[in-house]
Amino acid sequence: DWVVAPISVPENGKGPFPQRLNQLKSNKDRDTKIFYSITGPGADSPPEGVFAVEKETGWLLLNKPLDREEIAKYELFGHAVSENGASVEDPMNISIIVTDQNDHKPKFTQDTFRGSVLEGVLPGTSVMQVTATDEDDAIYTYNGVVAYSIHSQEPKDPHDLMFTIHRSTGTISVISSGLDREKVPEYTLTIQATDMDGDGSTTTAVAVVEILDANDNAPMFDPQKYEAHVPENAVGHEVQRLTVTDLDAPNSPAWRATYLIMGGDDGDHFTITTHPESNQGILTTRKGLDFEAKNQHTLYVEVTNEAPFVLKLPTSTATIVVHVEDVNEAPVFVPPSKVVEVQEGIPTGEPVCVYTAEDPDKENQKISYRILRDPAGWLAMDPDSGQVTAVGTLDREDEQFVRNNIYEVMVLAMDNGSPPTTGTGTLLLTLIDVNDHGPVPEPRQITICNQSPVRQVLNITDKDLSPHTSPFQAQLTDDSDIYWTAEVNEEGDTVVLSLKKFLKQDTYDVHLSLSDHGNKEQLTVIRATVCDCHGHVETCPGPWKGG
């Protein structure tokens, strides 16, 4: 039969070459002389000449060593022809399988592998995976089957078996308790890959395992006791810098300190922040301290980290004794703003009030007083007693200095400390109205026709306050009532002036006396221009003549 079974040829054969592999034979050779040939890759096409055939005998020849890793199988065709070149058989398939030899060592995909694992983990925790390849066959033989192992570990602390490697997958995992970044931050493992499933050629690489930080160390105060001195009343004053040490990774959340005042700050006088670089706790005053109230504060400060502890850790506490230093404090007027009612127009030298300050300091300091701002110059202040007296006429109706009945004065108190300090107070004099202004009509000039005259309505104003105002009363004096009448309206706030007899065109003085509800009388002269006209007029028609 014109067939041939698959031919297995080991790679790397040592010859001699050409090497006879198998004989092609057609049973047609009984009838005629047969010539054999082969075609295909490895024969007459690239890679040419690897195989040949003895033309007359049919022996298939191998001309050189084979490399399975280059070509693992050759597919050729055998041909049989008669002397005249006629084909006597169909082309026959010839399969040549190159069998593997263990001629390659494993190769790691990297010279150095890097992985990491959190400190303090339990055995079983995966760290990283390493990979080696082997070009040899791993399906039909063990030549390319790689087994992984750890050859050595540096350092060997706390002992030499901290990691293991899965022999087939190359996954490195933790095998021991005791990974401690603060003691060993990095391990270097020499790893091996061995073919023949661990019984063949070996190659090595390095696996570097970084031990990652966990917050397994508490920050500790160093020192734990502090004494500080702070002047009283200072706000935002740096009291003390507290120093901590933490074995965890610097500038990580497991290292950065968080401070908390645990006790001793009943009045919420202090605050503590973390310095972003030094990690120190900066204790400052949130409010001013009062030496006279409490001259010493004992604070208890606890420190933790930004990150939570991964296990139960004792927290460190610092004690800070803060001594409050006495400073000469300014006198304080009591109250800071004093409202006093006083009648306007009181006589000069009349007392207005006593306005004094208290000194927070415990020493019996002498306080002296003076007026700092008195816009109208109406007041004086006794430097020893704080007695305020009138030296000018207090006028409620003075619109330049009085607003809403209130006259505002600033006073100053000075102690005799070294250096002296001053405090200010505000004296608000509420001026009580006195009926010191009579009613005044508006306008005080009128123009009126001498025929069918229109009544002239004048508004009445009084600078005083009720009840020293309306209802008003009007009266004409100095014979003005011969030609004129004056009547106050029902509401009592306007006066109606009427011409009751004919007057020739001229300007006349009308003497009008107005009195308020408190009978304060005010005489006002109204200038009346009488025109030759009927009814309503604003200016006299034609040339004006004086009279």
């Epitope: 303090g120 339990l122 079983g124 095998i175 308790s177 991964v310």
Partner: antibody, heavy 117, light 111 residues
Framework: EVQLLESGGGLVQPGGSLRLSCAAS????????MSWVRQAPGKGLEWVSA????????YYADSVKGRFAISRDNSKNTLYLQMNSLRAEDTAVYYC??????????WGQGTMVTVSS | QSALTQPASVSGSPGQSITISCTGT?????????VSWYQQHPGKAPKLILS???KRPSGVSNRFSGSKSGNTASLSISGLQAEDEADYYC???????????FGGGTKLTVL
Amino acid sequence: EVQLLESGGGLVQPGGSLRLSCAASGFTFSSYAMSWVRQAPGKGLEWVSAISGSGGSTYYADSVKGRFAISRDNSKNTLYLQMNSLRAEDTAVYYCAGSRTVQFDPWGQGTMVTVSS
Amino acid sequence: QSALTQPASVSGSPGQSITISCTGTSNDVGAYNYVSWYQQHPGKAPKLILSEVNKRPSGVSNRFSGSKSGNTASLSISGLQAEDEADYYCTSYTMGSTFMLFGGGTKLTVL
């Protein structure tokens, strides 16, 4: 002498709680991962829970996850197992065991936990 | 159902040798050389007798030896003695949160 001494076992009703302790002496306690291993009457050994030397890492068997909590106090050289929502199948002798690598050595003498109504 | 398979019982006469097998998978026994063996006498705590397949802790008789082939580890006891009668458990390391797998235990009877 290396020694582990369990305590805290006893009779408890289903749904109840119990806290086991294991006092260690004779070795550097904080260098050892610690485990609880139990053995039901007439049965084999069953690993229950483990905790790393620092206490920062814990493991639990699926059968006890969410009900048991392992902890340790290295300053007292003591291991604990807080057992809540106890069931009849939790009845066993509970051993504490130390491990530097992946073998259990030393072992305690065990404490009996009985869950029964 | 235990993760590692052991015969429920084996027996032997004094002076004889016996072997107890412990079969796992390619991810535990087959993957790592971290098989340990424990001896437990009735009413007592387990005691480590072999670690890392074949390493004996100090104080353990050299009659105990261990080996591993593929996914199966074995404990051999030569020159059986009456005090060897006990339960024997194997454990194997495996990666993951159940980092120690236990065998179901083998009861050794010395006839």
